[in-house]
Interface confidence: low
């Protein structure tokens, strides 16, 4: 039985050219997190955080993705093409896999007011 829940930053908006933090937290379980995968809307992997091996940022994103804070991910130099869904996948022992969803909307600088909130999807 999987008892945990993933809390995410939910729906967020950020300015073009700026940066944004994507954050997921696993709670209500004592399962050990062995790996966290971060994927983009087209299911391409942005980064992996393995508990034993540390961070691996995929080459296509090395210029614009920074690890952290914590198990989160920081996207930098945002473009309009970054708008879309992002997924955190928590691989845990013994529970199995938990998945969280974040929707990022990148807005023209004149429009956006950076917003983020924690929510349980």
């Amino acid at each position: 039985m999987m008892t945990g829940t993933i809390e995410t930053t939910g729906n967020i908006s950020a300015k073009k050219g700026g940066s944004v933090i994507l954050q997921c937290h696993l709670s209500s379980t004592m399962a050990q997190v062995t790996q966290v995968n971060w994927e983009q809307h087209d299911h391409s992997l942005l980064a992996i955080r393995n508990a034993e091996l540390g961070w691996h940022i995929y080459p296509a994103f090395k210029d614009r993705v920074a690890p952290g804070p914590g198990l989160g991910l920081t996207l930098q130099s945002l473009t309009m093409n970054d708008t879309g869904e992002y997924f955190c996948t928590y691989h845990t022992y013994p529970d199995g896999t938990y998945r969280g969803r974040i929707f990022l909307e990148v807005l023209e600088s004149s429009v956006a007011e950076h917003s983020a909130r924690f929510q349980i999807p």
Epitope: M1, L71, P94
Partner: antibody, heavy 117, light 106 residues
Framework: EVQLQQSGPELVKPGASVKISCKAS????????MHWVKQSLGKSLEWIGY????????GYSQKFKSKVTLTVDRSSRTAYMDLRSLTSEDSAVFYC??????????WGQGTLVTVSA | QIVLTQSPAIMSASPGEKVTMTCSAS?????MHWYQQKSGTSPKRWIY???KLASGVPARFSGSVSGTSYSLTISSMEAEDAATYYC?????????FGAGTKLELK
């Protein structure tokens, strides 16, 4: 090298409280939960609960819920266990143990708590 | 809560003898782990994920499962194997230990 260094032995009076510490080194502290285990003299091991080293979330065995509070201080890489309303039944060795994929690969050296008037 | 019943509680074996101890789970568990503990010391992870030997554990040790009955076997007893062995399961938010099997040298 992973090490869990626990605080020293405690002699406490019935009804009192005690706080045991477990200082971690040799790994990324916030990546692993810290668990606590009780072993009464000549008896088996009993799981008390865990604390999430990243966000402080806790989970307790039903038996210990009213007896124990688990906390963590990320800055000093230390986990704590508060035991309250102590009785002779609480006299035991208490271990901290680091969570990992296959059970508890790393244990502290244990802290002996003796409850006596 | 899943109950783990270890048997026998106490056993003795001569050097070179094959030793088997069991841990029976009251219901299905994900994996079983085994710990070795000698008097006055902390437990050591001995076998994990049912059948994997922890670092430094001699190859004479093995772990297996049949249904909900888990076994730790020593192919040829040695003096240093005298200790208490505990099984432990971890299934979601339930974590329990068995009462232990004390293995003595005959």
């Amino acid at each position: 090298e992973v090490q869990l260094q626990q605080s020293g032995p405690e002699l406490v009076k019935p009804g009192a409280s005690v706080k045991i510490s477990c200082k971690a080194s040799g790994y990324t502290f916030t990546d692993y939960n810290m668990h606590w285990v009780k072993q009464s003299l000549g008896k088996s091991l009993e799981w008390i609960g865990y604390v999430n080293s990243f966000n402080g979330n806790t989970g307790y065995s039903q038996k210990f819920k009213s007896k124990v509070t688990l906390t963590v201080d990320r800055s000093s890489r230390t986990a704590y266990m508060d035991l309250r309303s102590l009785t002779s039944e609480d006299s035991a060795v208490f271990y901290c143990a680091r969570s990992s994929r296959g059970g508890f690969a790393y244990w502290g050296q244990g802290t002996l708590v003796t409850v006596s008037a | 809560q899943i109950v783990l019943t270890q048997s026998p509680a106490i056993m003795s074996a001569s050097p070179g003898e094959k030793v088997t101890m069991t841990c029976s789970a009251s219901s299905s568990v994900s994996y079983m782990h085994w710990y070795q503990q000698k008097s006055g010391t902390s437990p050591k992870r001995w076998i994990y994920d049912t059948s994997k030997l922890a670092s430094g554990v001699p190859a004479r040790f093995s772990g297996s499962v049949s249904g909900t009955s888990y076994s730790l076997t020593i192919s040829s007893m040695e003096a240093e194997d005298a200790a208490t062995y505990y099984c432990q399961q971890w299934s979601s938010n339930s974590l329990t230990f068995g009462a232990g099997t004390k293995l003595e040298l005959k």
